[in-house]
């Protein structure tokens, strides 16, 4: 277990022409804050993949208002470190993502507005326990200067925080209730398995199965306090000869950390290391918070205003849900008109239009007849977003470009023979039939059931279909 720490030194316009004066120009006052996201390994991960190693959000920086005449300064930054606790081994290779966010404080409808100013993504190798690594990165017109390190939380040590420490020698000659003046040197190795029941606080072992007691404790499992001590009887508060201190009220006395958090003293104060699922200065906050990086797909996590409100994820366009985990089905709104097919490409919507329509949303009805689409004397009939050609005799096909064979459909009835003619077809009827398509029988007594044939045509003559 350990903590990844990031210190932002400065954020401001980069060198060179065209750099912005400030993030707030013409927008009224604003302030900055930062989000750090850690992902394991060096592979190129999708931007929306979760911050598997952890994430953290800084406090808001001081409010900044641009002074029109003043030279562009480095922008006022939030105080303190960004800390990302990690529970398991430190991977050594990781992706570091630092986002700079702007919070606009002008009169916004619906409260403050957040926008991402800059995002730096770098793949890094870093051993835990090493010195601060310094870096300068440019993101667009902005420049970010920062330092970072990974450190183990005792008893874990080593470059991956996987080895555990135990005291090398007897801790001190201090009795119960007294503590050593100086920190002990650590010897680090995988600890042996002690005798079952051996006190975790007051016992240790160098060989499997044994239980050796720290000074001031006795008994087979080191659970019995010893009544005498080399430090007892001292009049003053400390003694250099024995190296023992009578403890004053230390900042960790009374255990200020809630929910099983472990307390460690810092100069003039204390620090709680919280178990997973607990947060806050004293581990008093339960459940999932912004420190877990719960907002997916680039959503911005903002803590709630009162102690019980959950965080809020501000989702980027195209995503919704309490954790921005759901892709908005923008096609469900049926943005494509006139039967166009909707395609959601993630970064944009695209409409694939049916024939006869055009435009980003297929909203334009094309006049298909405008370009005289019908050949060979065909006439264009428009309708339903498409066009249809009514072709002249002897031509067919979509645009009347194909020469039609009028006899292909065998139009002459009762065995009549069909002849293609420049303006259509002619049927030569078999004996006993007449009419344009030889559809009428001729009566045996020679009297037609039809009106007399037109002048110049006798029954049996080929009849031209007009």
């Amino acid at each position: 277990a350990g903590v990844f720490e990031l210190q932002i030194h400065s954020f401001g316009p980069g060198p060179g022409p065209g750099a912005p004066r400030s993030p707030c120009s013409a927008r009224g006052p604003c302030r900055l804050f930062f989000r750090v996201c850690l992902k394991p390994g060096l592979s190129e991960e999708a931007a929306e993949s979760p911050c598997a190693l952890g994430a953290a959000l800084s406090a808001r920086g001081p409010v900044y208002t641009e002074q029109p005449e003043a030279p562009a300064p480095d922008l006022p930054l939030p105080n303190g470190l960004l800390q990302v606790p990690f529970r398991d081994a430190w991977p050594g290779t990781f992706s570091l993502i630092i986002e700079t966010w702007r919070e606009e404080l002008g009169d916004q409808i619906g409260g403050p507005a957040w926008s991402l100013l800059a995002r730096v993504t770098r793949r890094r190798r870093l051993a835990a326990g090493g010195p601060w690594a310094r870096d300068i990165q440019r993101a667009g017109a902005w420049e970010l200067r920062f330092s970072y390190r990974a450190r183990c939380e005792l008893p874990a040590v080593g470059t991956a925080c996987t080895r555990l420490c135990r005291p090398r020698s007897a801790p001190s000659r201090c009795g119960p209730g007294l503590r050593p003046c100086a920190p002990l040197e650590d010897e680090c190795e995988a600890p042996p398995v002690c005798r079952a029941g051996c006190s975790l606080e007051h016992g240790f072992c160098e060989q499997p199965g044994e239980c050796r007691c720290l000074e001031g404790w006795t008994g087979p499992l080191c659970m019995v306090p010893v009544s005498t001590s080399s430090c007892l009887g001292l009049r003053g508060p400390s003694s250099t000869t024995t190296g023992c201190l009578v403890p004053g009220p230390g900042p960790c006395d009374g255990n200020p950390c809630a929910n099983g958090g472990s307390c460690s003293e810092t100069p003039g104060s204390f620090e709680c290391t919280c178990p997973r699922g607990f947060y806050g200065l004293r581990c008093e906050v339960s459940g999932v918070t912004c420190a877990d990086g719960p907002c997916f797909n680039g959503g911005l996590c903002v803590g709630g205003a009162d102690p019980d409100s959950a965080y809020i994820c501000h989702c980027p366009p195209g995503f919704q849900g309490s954790n921005c985990e759901k892709r908005v089905d923008r096609c469900s709104l049926q943005p494509c008109r006139n039967g166009g097919l909707c395609l959601d490409l993630g970064h944009a919507l695209r409409c694939r239009c049916r024939a006869g329509f055009a435009g980003p949303r297929c909203e334009h009805d094309l006049d298909d007849c405008a370009g005289r689409a019908c050949a060979n004397g065909g006439t264009c009939v428009e309708g339903g977003g498409a066009h249809r050609c009514s072709c002249a005799l002897g031509f067919g096909g979509r645009n009347c470009r194909e020469r039609a064979d009028p006899c292909a459909a065998r139009p002459c009835a009762h065995g009549g023979r069909c002849y293609a003619h420049f303006s259509g077809l002619v049927c030569a009827c078999a004996p006993g039939y007449m009419g344009a398509r030889c559809e009428f029988p001729v009566h045996p007594d020679g009297v037609s059931a039809l009106p007399a044939a037109p002048p110049g045509l006798r029954p049996g003559d080929p009849q031209r279909y007009l």
């Epitope: 255990n255 906050v285 459940g287």
Partner: antibody, heavy 118, light 107 residues
Framework: QVQLQQPGAELVKPGTSVKLSCEAS????????MQWVRQRPGQGLEWIGM????????NYNENFQTKATLTVDKSSSTAYMQLSSLTSEDSAVYYC???????????WGQGTSVTVSS | DIQMTQTTSSLSVSLGDRVTINCSAS??????LNWYQQKPDGTVKLLIY???NLHSGVPSRFSGSGSGTDYSLTISNLEPEDIATYYC?????????FGGGTKLEIK
């Protein structure tokens, strides 16, 4: 509004197991610890353990470590507690409760009464 | 484990009384203490969190105080609906533990 639904009662035989459910609604289930508490007849409340659905982290009271197993089904916003190797000592009312941000159990289920009897 | 002790297991009270229920911890718990009410039908409600903060919807006649190892819940003007059993609970470390409960009974 926040609600935790628990079945009213379970009658089970000694030596068997029972899986109690607690269906949550009205809040983002994954983001809050779910607590389980036991109350034997005529006795006080005993904390069994807790689970954080977001990451399946659990904390158990050592006295219940071998007795209770806590799980969740995020898709149905339901927390479960399986009690194994039941004896008459396990006859009790079992409550689920949501742990608020400020580490208090702010909403409780009605409790499931478990009776172990042959 | 931290033991939580409610010395009075039952208390005879009258409506309108000012009632104080005490709870002590076997070691300092840095104000990490909550109070709960359990009605006779088994319903449990949060009253006070972090020693003295009133949970939303809880009447202002309830208040909490204390520090170190000693804590108390006060009901300033007892109403009929306050007849119930009251439990303290710490969250300083695991396991969380409850007090044995204090049952209010009408005289």
């Amino acid at each position: 509004q926040v609600q935790l639904q628990q079945p009213g009662a379970e009658l089970v035989k000694p030596g068997t197991s029972v899986k109690l459910s607690c269906e949550a609604s009205g809040y983002t289930f994954s983001n809050y610890w779910m607590q389980w508490v036991r109350q034997r007849p005529g006795q006080g409340l005993e904390w069994i353990g807790m689970i954080l659905p977001n990451s399946d982290i659990t904390n158990y009271n050592e006295n219940f470590q071998t007795k209770a197993t806590l799980t969740v089904d995020k898709s149905s916003s339901t927390a479960y507690m399986q009690l194994s190797s039941l004896t008459s000592e396990d006859s009790a009312v079992y409550y689920c409760a949501r742990q608020a941000r400020y580490s208090a159990m702010d909403y409780w289920g009605q409790g499931t009464s478990v009776t172990v009897s042959s | 484990d931290i033991q939580m002790t409610q010395t009075t297991s039952s208390l005879s009270v009258s409506l309108g009384d000012r009632v104080t229920i005490n709870c002590s911890a076997s070691q300092g718990i840095s104000n990490y203490l909550n109070w709960y009410q359990q009605k006779p039908d088994g319903t449990v409600k949060l009253l006070i969190y972090y020693t003295s903060n009133l949970h939303s919807g809880v009447p202002s006649r309830f208040s909490g105080s204390g520090s170190g190892t000693d804590y108390s819940l006060t009901i300033s003007n007892l109403e009929p609906e306050d007849i119930a059993t009251y439990y303290c609970q710490h969250y300083s470390k695991f396991p969380y533990t409850f007090g044995g409960g204090t049952k209010l009974e009408i005289k």
